[in-house]
């Protein structure tokens, strides 16, 4: 806290410029008008102030705007954004994507801070949904952003926004998140032809149901093992050996290396050993020949 003292004669700042770095903290407090500072915040970002001097400038803005800064000031906060508390940021009304970008740039290369998380939350809530341009921006700065959202939050993502999602943006998503995103992706890419469709939908397939995997198996997609291993176990189990062979194409040989891991392990246990042998991969653990398999869930449905 800087003591209130009168500004020395001739030192009253007429504009925000480099000469202010020669002001002591108390002089900045006494000689820089808060309203002038607010209108010339963009200049602050070109002046090499010390952190202590910036604290004084922030204090002046806090006094001028106790209910929260206007967007005209927020857009030019630069480093001062990192000095804000989440409580400060909750008072803001940020509507411009340019403002969001400018503040994310300041934090670029760092983990998502509480300030950034709060800013994004305020911005998205203000927009009402996670539109394509916002998603584009957020995933460019934070590739893991999408997977940090709850399934409930993801439900507000319109299918049109899915076009902005890159495969790496989904790396840390869990099955519950992919369950929400997959139907949106299916809708977004529905007008694409087979091979193009598969390229786009591939990253989302961790949320695909059995019937969609069966449909893909009819399209010569040659799914790689990495994608197959991310599929929902419950979606893979009903697939026949022939369907998995068609789904994987030349990659089917990779099943051998994954036979002890889910979902391959669980799928093998559900297949007839005779059928597995047709692959010629030496997969073991299928249902022995001559055994009768009762599907109890089907029996319950009939009774």
């Amino acid at each position: 806290e800087v003591e209130k003292t009168a500004c020395p004669s001739g030192k009253k700042a007429r504009e925000i410029d480099e000469s202010l770095i020669f002001y002591k903290k108390w002089e900045l407090e006494a000689c820089v008008d808060a309203a002038l500072l607010a209108t010339q915040m963009d200049r602050v970002n070109a002046i090499p102030f010390t952190y202590e001097q910036l604290d004084v400038l922030k204090h002046k803005l806090d006094e001028l705007y106790p209910q929260g800064y206007p967007e005209s000031v927020i857009q030019h906060l630069g480093y001062l954004f990192l000095k804000m508390s989440p409580e400060d940021i909750r008072k803001w009304n940020v509507t411009s994507l340019e403002t969001l970008k400018a503040l994310l740039e300041v934090n670029k290369g760092h983990e998502m801070s509480p300030q950034v998380a709060t800013l994004i939350d305020r911005f998205v809530k203000g927009r009402g949904q996670l539109d394509k341009d916002t998603l584009d921006t957020l995933t460019a700065f934070y590739p893991g952003y999408l997977c940090s959202l709850s399934p409930e939050e993801l439900s507000s993502v319109p299918p049109s926004s899915i076009w902005a999602v890159r495969p790496q943006d989904l790396d840390t998503c869990d099955p519950r998140q992919l369950d929400v995103l997959y139907p949106k992706a299916r809708l977004a890419f529905q007008n694409m032809n087979g091979s193009e469709y598969f390229v786009k939908i591939q990253s989302f397939l961790g949320g695909a149901p059995t019937e969609d995997l069966k449909a893909l198996s009819q399209q010569n997609v040659s799914m790689d093992l990495a994608t197959f291993m991310k599929l929902r176990t419950d979606a893979v189990l009903p697939l026949t050996v022939a369907e998995v062979q068609k789904l994987l194409g030349p990659h089917v040989e990779g099943l051998k290396a994954e036979e002890r891991h889910r979902p391959v392990r669980d799928w093998i246990l559900r297949q007839r050993q005779d059928d597995l042998d047709t692959l010629g991969l030496g997969l073991q653990g299928g249902i022995p020949n001559g055994y009768l398999v009762l599907d109890l869930s089907m029996q319950e449905a009939l009774s």
Partner: nanobody, 115 residues
């Protein structure tokens, strides 16, 4: 983001020193740089500044005509040439920088003693 100062030391009154400010883990080229100093028991004060291009420089009244700030963007370094040093120039000298989007960096300081 971290800046690193060097070149401080002990010098006699009337002597000269050249301080350097370099960046650690990033490049200084698009950063405007300010030099500051803090004498024992006193508040940190501004000494000089230089724009990112090097085209604009400023000095505190107390060092005008004695100190010169410059930069060599090929070496990613900013210099403070200090001539005609006086005992009252004794302090820890720091550089601070501001780059694109208001990103900031500051150093830990280098000590200058004029005695």
């Amino acid at each position: 983001l971290q800046l690193v100062e060097s070149g401080g030391g002990l010098v006699q009154p009337g002597g000269s020193l050249r301080l350097s400010c370099a960046a650690s883990g990033f490049t200084l080229d698009n950063y405007a740089i300010g030099w500051f100093r803090q004498a024992p028991g006193k508040e940190r004060e501004g000494v000089s500044s230089i724009s990112s291009s090097g085209g604009s420089t400023n000095y505190a009244d107390s060092v005008k005509g004695r100190f010169t700030v410059s930069r060599d963007n090929a070496k990613h370094t900013v210099y403070l040439q200090m001539n005609s040093l006086k005992p009252e120039d004794t302090a820890v000298y720091y550089c601070a920088g501001v780059g694109n989007y208001g990103r900031r960096a500051m150093g830990q300081g280098t000590s200058v003693t004029v005695s």
